[in-house]
C-alpha cells in the first residue's frame, strides 16, 4: 500500500483546503524534472530559469554562461543544439507543431567563436528537422521533405534527396502512420558514430488513401486537411533505407540498404536503425503481420563501396503467442566488440527480460530472469550493464534502476534506486553521460519528483538538481486524497488498481466511484507516481472515489497478461474493468448507485463498450476521443493487434467489437461523447458513427464536439473540457455545485 | 581494371528513338550511381542523367525530363538510356561516367548520336 | 542552376612553364564539390582533381586543386607535352551538376 501523506493533524484542519478545479486547470501544482544535456563525460548544459545556457562540469565544479539569454531572445529562441565541436549552436524559434513529435521551425547558426550569427547561406525556413553531426559540425536538415547537408554552417548545403512531395514522399522524415505508430519520433535520419555516414528513411505515400477533415479557422470557407493515413486493411506506405557518405556525397550517391528476403517477400515496415560503428549499421525490419521481426546487421564493404547485409546477421525474432516485442519491438544496444548486443524480448516463461545475443538468437543468453520485467536498458558500458524493472518487492507499476556487472564473472546485479528515499521514489528513469562516467536520476513519485546526480562508478548521490521545494511548500495546506495500490485475484487473473480516496475517507461510508480506464495494449495506468490532476480534485474536493485498474492487455506483468487480448481488443480489457467493479463494491465502501466509467482515446473505447455493457452497474460516463471501430483506426497499431480485417483473417471481430453495435445498450445510462474536429489520430467520423448510430437507435445522449481541436484537445479547450465533465459528474452522482 | 563501353548510337531521324547502353565492368556495378554526359560537337560538357546503384532514383536535366530515360540492369552491369522525341540539339557524343553528380573518375569512349533529316 | 565561368579561355605556354586556370562560381559550391576534368582531342574527359580537392588516382603531383566559396584554381606546376588539351571544371553541390566552358592550354 502507497499511501500519500495527507498531512492533516486536527489542530490544523481549519487551515487545510480541498484542491478546486481551478487549481488543476492552471497548473498549480506541477512539478519540474531535471534531465541534464550531457555533452560529455562530465559536462552537461542546462537552460536555467533566466534563460541562459549554461554549461557545467561536474569535475571541477565550474559552470559558464554560453548563450546569454540575449542572444536566445535576439531571435525568440525557444530550443538550441549546441555543435559537437562546440563551435556552434543552433537556435530554433517560430516552433509550429505539426502532428504528436512533429514540428516545424525556424533555425538560426551562432558562432560561439566570434559571437556572432552566421551569415551568408541562411537556413531556409521552416525547417521540418536539423542535427549535428555527432562529431565536428555538420548539419542534415529536412526542408520541404528533402534532405540536406552542408559541411559547416556558413557552407552552401548538398541536396541529398529530389523527390520530396508534400504528402506523397518523405526523406528524412515519418509520415503520419511511422511517426505514430512505428518511430515515435520527428525524425527518420541517422548520422554514423563519426558523422563519416548519413542514414535516411524514404516513405513513400503515394497510393495511401487520404483522411480528410475540415479545418474551420476563421476564413469564410473552412480549409481541408489531408492527411495520406492508413487504416486498417489499406495500403501502406513503402520505406526504403539510403546511407551516403557525408565526405565526398556527390559522387557514390545514396546507396539502398537491402531488406531481408523474409521481410520483402510480402508487405513490411522499417522499425528502426541503430548504428554500431562508422561500418556497421543495425536495421530492424517487420512483416505487416507484426508477429515477425528481422534484425540485419549491415556492414560497408570499402573494396566494393557497397553496404552488404549477410543472412548470417539476420536475427529473427517471432511471437507464437501475440505480436512481437512489446508496444514495439525492443531495440539493440551494442556491446563494445561492435557486433553482440543486448535486447529485452520474451523468454521461455513469456516475461520479457534482458538477453545477450552474440551469434544466433537461438543461442541467447538471458541475463534478467524472473517473474516481472526487464523495461529498459539504458547503457552497457565495459563492465557494467544498466537497465530498469519493476522486480523490486513485485510491484508491477515501479520502476527501480540496476546495475549488471558484465565485466566479472558471474555478473552480480544491484539495485541502485531500490533503497535510496524508498517511500518518496519508487519509479525512476535514469539519464547517462558518455561512457556512464555520472548520471541523472529522475524519480516520478509517489512522492514528490526529485532530480538527482550521481557518480557512475560508485552511484554516490553528488547533488539535488531539481527537488520541487516550491511545490513541497504549495501542498502543505492542501488536503490531499490518499492513494493506494493493490492487486485483486480473479480466475488466476491479478488486476492491479490503484485507487484514490477522499482525505477524509471512512471505510463505513458510502463513497460514488469514478473508474479511469486507458486499457490499451501494453499500456499501464497503474504506475506509483506523483500526480495532482483532475482525478485528484474530485477526491479532494467532491468526495468521489477513483479508481485505475490494470486488466489483461496491459504490460510489464508477463505475456499471458499482455497477449490475452490478441486478435480480440474490447473483450477481456472491458470484463476486466467490470470484474474490479464488482469487487470494488464488495468492499463495502461504494455507492453501487453511483458509479461511472470514463477514458480518452483507447480508454473512451473501453469506457463505451464498458457503458454499452449491459451489467447494469454504471450510472454514466464519458468517452473522450474514442475509437468506435478498428476499421477507422491506423493500420500500424491496430493489425499490431488485431491482424487484417478481411473475411480469412479477424474481419468477424472487427465488426463485433465496434461501439455503433451495441448502441440500444447505451438506453438505460448517461452517455457524454466528447471529441476534437480536427483530430489526426482518432478522427472525428470515430465519434460521428458512434453518434449516427445512437440516434438512429432513438437513444439519448449528451455529446460536445471542440472545433478545429486535436486529440490532445489543448489550451482553452482544456478548461472547458474538465468544466464540462466535472458538471456531468456531479449531476450524475448529485453532487451539489 | 575499371571499363566503361558504350554502344547503340547512330543516325536518327527528329522525334525518332535510340538506346544507348553502356556495358560496365571491373568494379561493383551495384554500388555506383552512374552517370550519362553528353558533347555537342566541339561544345564542353553537359550532364543529362544519373541513376543511383539500386536503381530506384533517377535525375535528368530539364533539356531531356519527359523525353529521356536512364535505367541499370544490375545483373548485367548495364547502364541504359533511352532516348525518345529527339531532337537536332540532342546530336552528340554521349559518355557513360562512374559518379552521381560529381567525381566522374572512370569514362567510357563515348558513341555518337546524331540528329537529322 | 549554378554557371561556371572558366577564364583564360585559351591559354598558351611553353612546356616546363606553370599554369594556372580559374573556375568562377554564381553561387557559393565549396571545394568539396568541385572537380577537374582533363580532356584531349577524340578522347574521353579524364578526371584530375576529385571533389575535395583530392589528386585523382594515377595523377601526378603537379596537378593541384585550390580555392573555395565560389573561386577555384587549377595548378599545373610544370607543363608536360602532354598537358596540353581542354580543362573543365565541374560542380556537384547542385541538381543540375553543370561544368565550365573549358580552358584551352596550347602550346605556345
Known amino acids: 500500500i502507497v499511501l500519500r501523506p495527507s498531512r492533516v493533524h486536527n489542530s490544523e484542519e481549519n487551515t487545510m483546503r480541498a484542491l478546486t478545479l481551478k487549481d488543476i486547470l492552471n497548473g498549480t501544482f506541477s512539478y519540474k524534472t531535471f534531465f541534464p544535456n550531457w555533452i560529455s563525460g562530465q559536462e552537461y548544459l542546462h537552460q536555467s530559469a533566466d534563460n541562459n545556457i549554461v554549461l557545467y562540469n561536474i569535475e571541477t565544479g565550474q559552470s559558464y554562461t554560453i548563450l546569454s539569454n540575449r542572444t536566445m531572445k535576439s531571435v525568440n529562441a525557444s530550443n538550441y543544439g549546441l555543435s559537437p565541436d562546440r563551435q556552434f549552436v543552433y537556435l530554433e524559434s517560430d516552433y509550429s507543431k505539426l502532428w504528436r513529435y512533429s514540428y516545424t521551425a525556424t533555425y538560426y547558426i551562432y558562432d560561439l567563436s566570434n559571437g556572432e550569427f552566421v551569415r551568408g547561406n541562411e537556413l531556409p525556413r521552416p525547417i521540418q528537422y536539423l542535427c549535428w553531426s555527432p562529431v565536428g559540425s555538420k548539419l542534415a536538415y529536412v526542408y520541404q521533405n528533402n534532405i540536406y547537408l552542408k559541411q559547416r554552417p556558413g557552407d552552401p548545403p548538398f541536396q541529398i534527396t529530389f523527390n520530396g512531395r508534400e504528402n506523397k514522399i518523405f526523406n528524412g522524415i515519418p509520415d503520419w502512420v511511422y511517426e505514430e505508430e512505428m518511430l515515435a519520433t520527428k525524425y527518420a535520419l541517422w548520422w554514423s558514430p563519426n558523422g563519416k555516414f548519413l542514414a535516411y528513411a524514404e516513405f513513400n505515400d503515394t497510393d495511401i488513401p487520404v483522411i480528410a477533415y475540415s479545418y474551420y479557422g476563421d476564413e469564410q470557407y473552412p480549409r481541408t486537411i489531408n492527411i495520406p493515413y492508413p487504416k486498417a486493411g489499406a495500403k501502406n506506405p513503402v520505406v526504403r533505407i539510403f546511407i551516403i557518405d557525408t565526405t565526398y556525397p556527390a559522387y557514390v550517391g545514396p546507396q539502398e540498404v537491402p531488406v531481408p528476403a523474409m521481410i520483402a517477400s510480402s508487405d513490411y515496415y522499417f522499425s528502426w536503425l541503430t548504428w554500431v560503428t562508422d561500418e556497421r549499421v543495425c536495421l530492424q525490419w517487420l512483416k505487416r503481420v507484426q508477429n515477425v521481426s528481422v534484425l540485419s546487421i549491415c556492414d560497408f564493404r570499402e573494396d566494393w563501396q557497397t553496404w552488404d547485409c549477410p543472412k548470417t546477421q539476420e536475427h529473427i525474432e517471432e511471437s507464437r503467442t501475440g505480436w512481437a516485442g512489446g508496444f514495439f519491438v525492443s531495440t539493440p544496444v551494442f556491446s563494445y566488440d561492435a557486433i553482440s548486443y543486448y535486447k529485452i524480448f520474451s523468454d521461455k516463461d513469456g516475461y520479457k527480460h534482458i538477453h545477450y545475443i552474440k551469434d544466433t538468437v537461438e543461442n541467447a543468453i538471458q541475463i534478467t530472469s524472473g517473474k516481472w520485467e526487464a523495461i529498459n536498458i539504458f547503457r552497457v558500458t565495459q563492465d557494467s550493464l544498466f537497465y530498469s524493472s519493476n522486480e523490486f518487492e513485485e510491484y508491477p507499476g515501479r520502476r527501480n534502476i540496476y546495475r549488471i556487472s558484465i565485466g566479472s564473472y558471474p555478473p552480480s546485479k544491484k539495485c541502485v534506486t531500490c533503497h535510496l528515499r524508498k517511500e518518496r521514489c519508487q519509479y525512476y528513469t535514469a539519464s547517462f553521460s558518455d561512457y556512464a562516467k555520472y548520471y541523472a536520476l529522475v524519480c516520478y513519485g509517489p512522492g514528490i519528483p526529485i532530480s538527482t546526480l550521481h557518480d557512475g562508478r560508485t552511484d554516490q548521490e553528488i547533488k539535488i538538481l531539481e527537488e520541487n521545494k516550491e511545490l513541497e511548500n504549495a501542498l502543505k495546506n492542501i488536503q490531499l486524497p490518499k492513494e493506494e495500490i493493490k492487486k485483486l485475484e480473479v480466475d488466476e487473473i491479478t488486476l492491479w488498481y490503484k485507487m484514490i480516496l477522499p482525505p477524509q475517507f471512512d471505510r463505513s461510508k458510502k463513497y460514488p466511484l469514478l473508474i479511469q480506464v486507458y486499457g490499451g495494449p501494453c499500456s499501464q495506468s497503474v504506475r506509483s507516481v506523483f500526480a495532482v490532476n483532475w482525478i485528484s480534485y474530485l477526491a479532494s474536493k467532491e468526495g468521489m472515489v477513483i479508481a485505475l485498474v490494470d486488466g489483461r492487455g496491459t504490460a510489464f506483468q508477463g505475456d499471458k497478461l499482455l497477449y490475452a487480448v490478441y486478435r480480440k481488443l474490447g473483450v477481456y480489457e472491458v470484463e476486466d474493468q467490470i470484474t474490479a467493479v464488482r469487487k470494488f463494491i464488495e468492499m463495502g465502501f461504494i455507492d453501487e448507485k453511483r458509479i461511472a466509467i470514463w477514458g480518452w482515446s483507447y480508454g473512451g473505447y473501453v469506457s463505451s463498450l464498458a457503458l454499452a455493457s449491459g451489467t447494469g452497474l454504471f450510472k454514466c460516463g464519458i468517452a473522450v476521443a474514442p475509437v468506435s471501430s478498428w476499421e477507422y483506426y491506423a493500420s500500424v497499431y491496430t493489425e499490431r493487434f488485431m491482424g487484417l480485417p478481411t473475411k480469412d483473417d479477424n474481419l468477424e471481430h472487427y465488426k463485433n467489437s465496434t461501439v455503433m453495435a451495441r448502441a440500444e445498450y447505451f438506453r438505460n445510462v448517461d452517455y457524454l461523447l466528447i471529441h476534437g474536429t480536427a483530430d489526426d489520430n482518432v478522427h472525428f467520423q470515430n465519434s460521428a458513427q458512434i453518434a449516427k448510430a445512437l440516434v438512429n437507435a432513438q437513444v439519448d445522449f449528451q455529446a460536445m464536439w471542440y472545433s478545429d481541436q486535436n486529440h490532445g484537445l489543448s489550451g482553452l479547450s482544456t478548461n472547458h473540457l474538465y468544466t464540462h465533465m466535472t458538471h456531468f459528474l456531479k449531476q450524475c452522482f448529485s453532487l451539489s455545485d | 581494371e575499371v571499363q566503361l563501353l558504350e554502344s547503340g548510337g547512330g543516325l536518327v531521324q527528329p522525334g525518332g528513338s535510340l538506346r544507348l547502353s553502356c556495358a560496365a565492368s571491373?568494379?561493383?556495378?551495384?554500388?555506383?550511381?552512374m552517370s550519362w554526359v553528353r558533347q555537342a560537337p566541339g561544345k564542353g560538357l553537359e550532364w543529362v542523367s544519373a541513376?543511383?546503384?539500386?536503381?530506384?532514383?533517377?535525375y535528368y536535366a530539364d533539356s531531356v525530363k519527359g523525353r529521356f530515360t536512364i535505367s541499370r540492369d544490375n545483373s548485367k552491369n548495364t547502364l541504359y538510356l533511352q532516348m525518345n522525341s529527339l531532337r537536332a540539339e540532342d546530336t552528340a557524343v554521349y559518355y557513360c561516367?562512374?559518379?552521381?553528380?560529381?567525381?566522374?573518375?572512370?569514362w567510357g569512349q563515348g558513341t555518337l548520336v546524331t540528329v537529322s533529316s | 542552376e549554378i554557371v561556371l565561368t572558366q577564364s583564360p579561355g585559351t591559354l598558351s605556354l611553353s612546356p616546363g612553364e606553370r599554369a594556372t586556370l580559374s573556375c568562377r562560381a554564381s553561387?557559393?559550391?565549396?571545394?568539396?564539390?568541385l572537380a577537374w576534368y582533363q580532356q584531349k582531342p577524340g578522347q574521353a574527359p579524364r578526371l584530375l582533381i576529385n571533389?575535395?580537392?583530392r589528386r585523382a588516382t594515377g595523377i601526378p603531383d603537379r596537378f593541384s586543386g585550390s580555392g573555395s566559396g565560389t573561386d577555384f584554381t587549377l595548378t599545373i606546376s610544370r607543363l608536360e607535352p602532354e598537358d596540353f588539351a581542354v580543362y573543365y571544371c565541374?560542380?556537384?553541390?547542385?541538381?543540375?551538376?553543370?561544368f565550365g566552358q573549358g580552358t584551352k592550354v596550347e602550346i605556345k
Open positions: 561516367a562512374k559518379g552521381w553528380f560529381g567525381g566522374f573518375n572512370y
Open positions: 571491373g568494379f561493383t556495378f551495384s554500388s555506383y550511381a
Open positions: 541513376i543511383i546503384g539500386s536503381g530506384s532514383i533517377t
Open positions: 553561387q557559393s559550391v565549396t571545394s568539396s564539390y
Open positions: 571533389v575535395g580537392s
Open positions: 565541374q560542380q556537384g553541390i547542385m541538381l543540375p551538376p553543370t
